[in-house]
């Protein structure tokens, strides 16, 4: 069957150091257990996280993306997840996209992570 | 199956203050947003206040901002409304809602509370 | 803010008829959506979310479409469960508005 995918219609702010939650959905909701979910990077499709088979498929990782990130799967029975990524770099900061794969139907939503300096400020006055 | 059971209602004066509670079963409460909405008797639905599923981040209604706090104890399955100041505007039927996913791509809601009505007078 | 707003206020039909409801946005909202169902004295019920998917368990009956500002909700074939209070939803953006509501009576 077919579904759209949606992501944040907004960019997300998220500061260097500290961890970032992306959310992605099917539409209609629907398990996607059994489907390919995936994030990665434009312009080159760097592999941020992927899930497969059933489980993260780790080995398919940008080496920058080792060890940072985690699928929250708690509601991927209702199409819903979220990708969690720890320590936040000033690389970071970008367009993501994430899919979902079913056999061979596949659709996904573009998001988009500003990454701001906890420890910049502006001196008043 | 989901179950949302809000307490806490009641009769105010003016100025005073009340904390609703809202009760969640049926779910991973920490995984979904949850939010208050409200219905003053005879009017529409108003909302007030989103959380997220980890707490970290609120949204308020510019009526309630400054007045209202919403929060949440995962461990406890419960959603909470503090309301300071209370005007006799807020007199409504407050409903606790379970939000579809999270605050920035699912904040309509699939599952509603029976509502507790909330009364502002002197 | 984004403004909703939902006409008619009211409208009067009988069983069998095709219903539509019309939901506005002061500004685009993309598909983000939802339509709920409230009859008196009960908490509302979702039956549409973004724009167009049905809500699991909802009858096929009611539908919805439209994106960007124009929203419909349509029900083809209005059965006497289905008089109550309809409302429409934006979720693009805070804060969250509802449309004033459209209530469909028994004509």
């Known amino acids: 069957g077919q579904f759209r995918v949606i992501g944040p219609r907004h960019p997300i702010r998220a500061l260097v150091g500290d961890e970032v939650e992306l959310p992605c959905r099917i539409s209609p909701g629907k398990n996607a257990t059994g489907m390919e979910v995936g994030w990665y990077r434009p312009p080159f499709s760097r592999v941020v996280h992927l899930y497969r088979n059933g489980k993260d498929q780790d080995g398919d990782q940008a080496p920058e993306y080792r060890g940072r990130t985690e699928l929250l799967k708690d509601a991927i029975g209702e199409g819903k997840v979220t990708l969690r990524i720890r320590n936040v770099r000033f690389s970071d900061e970008g367009g993501f996209t994430c899919f979902f794969r079913d056999h061979s139907y596949q659709e996904e939503a573009a998001m988009e992570l500003k990454v701001e300096d906890p420890f910049y400020w502006v001196s008043p006055g | 199956q989901v179950q949302l059971v809000e307490s806490g209602g009641g009769l105010v004066q003016p100025g005073g203050s009340l904390r609703l509670s809202c009760a969640a079963s049926?779910?991973?409460?920490?995984?979904?947003?949850m939010s208050w909405v409200r219905q003053a008797p005879g009017k529409g639905l108003e909302w007030v206040s989103v959380?997220?599923?980890?707490?970290?981040?609120?949204y308020y209604a510019d009526s309630v901002k400054g007045r209202f706090t919403i929060s949440r104890d995962n461990s406890k399955n419960t959603l909470y409304l503090q309301m300071n100041s209370l005007r006799a505007e807020d007199t409504a039927v407050y409903y606790c809602?379970?939000?579809?996913?999270?605050?920035?791509?699912?904040?309509?809601?699939?599952?509603w509370g029976q509502g507790t009505l909330v009364t502002v007078s002197s | 803010d984004i403004v909703m707003t939902q006409s008619p206020s009211s409208l009067s039909a009988s069983v069998g008829d095709r219903v539509t409801i019309t939901c506005r946005a002061s500004?685009?909202?993309?598909?983000?959506l939802a339509w709920y169902q409230q009859k008196p004295g009960k908490a509302p019920k979702l039956l549409i979310y973004?724009?167009?998917s049905l809500e699991s368990g909802v009858p096929s009956r009611f539908s919805g479409s439209g994106s960007g500002t124009d929203f419909t909700l349509t029900i083809s074939s209005l059965q006497p469960e289905d008089f109550a209070t309809y409302y429409c939803?934006?979720?693009?953006?805070?804060?969250?508005?509802f449309g004033g509501g459209t209530k469909v009576e028994i004509k």
């Open positions: 809602a379970k939000a579809y996913y999270d605050i920035l791509t699912g904040s309509l809601f699939d599952s």
């Open positions: 049926g779910f991973t409460f920490s995984s979904y947003a």
């Open positions: 959380i997220s599923g980890s707490g970290g981040s609120t």
């Open positions: 500004q685009g909202i993309s598909s983000a």
């Open positions: 973004d724009a167009s």
């Open positions: 939803q934006q979720f693009n953006s805070y804060p969250l508005t």
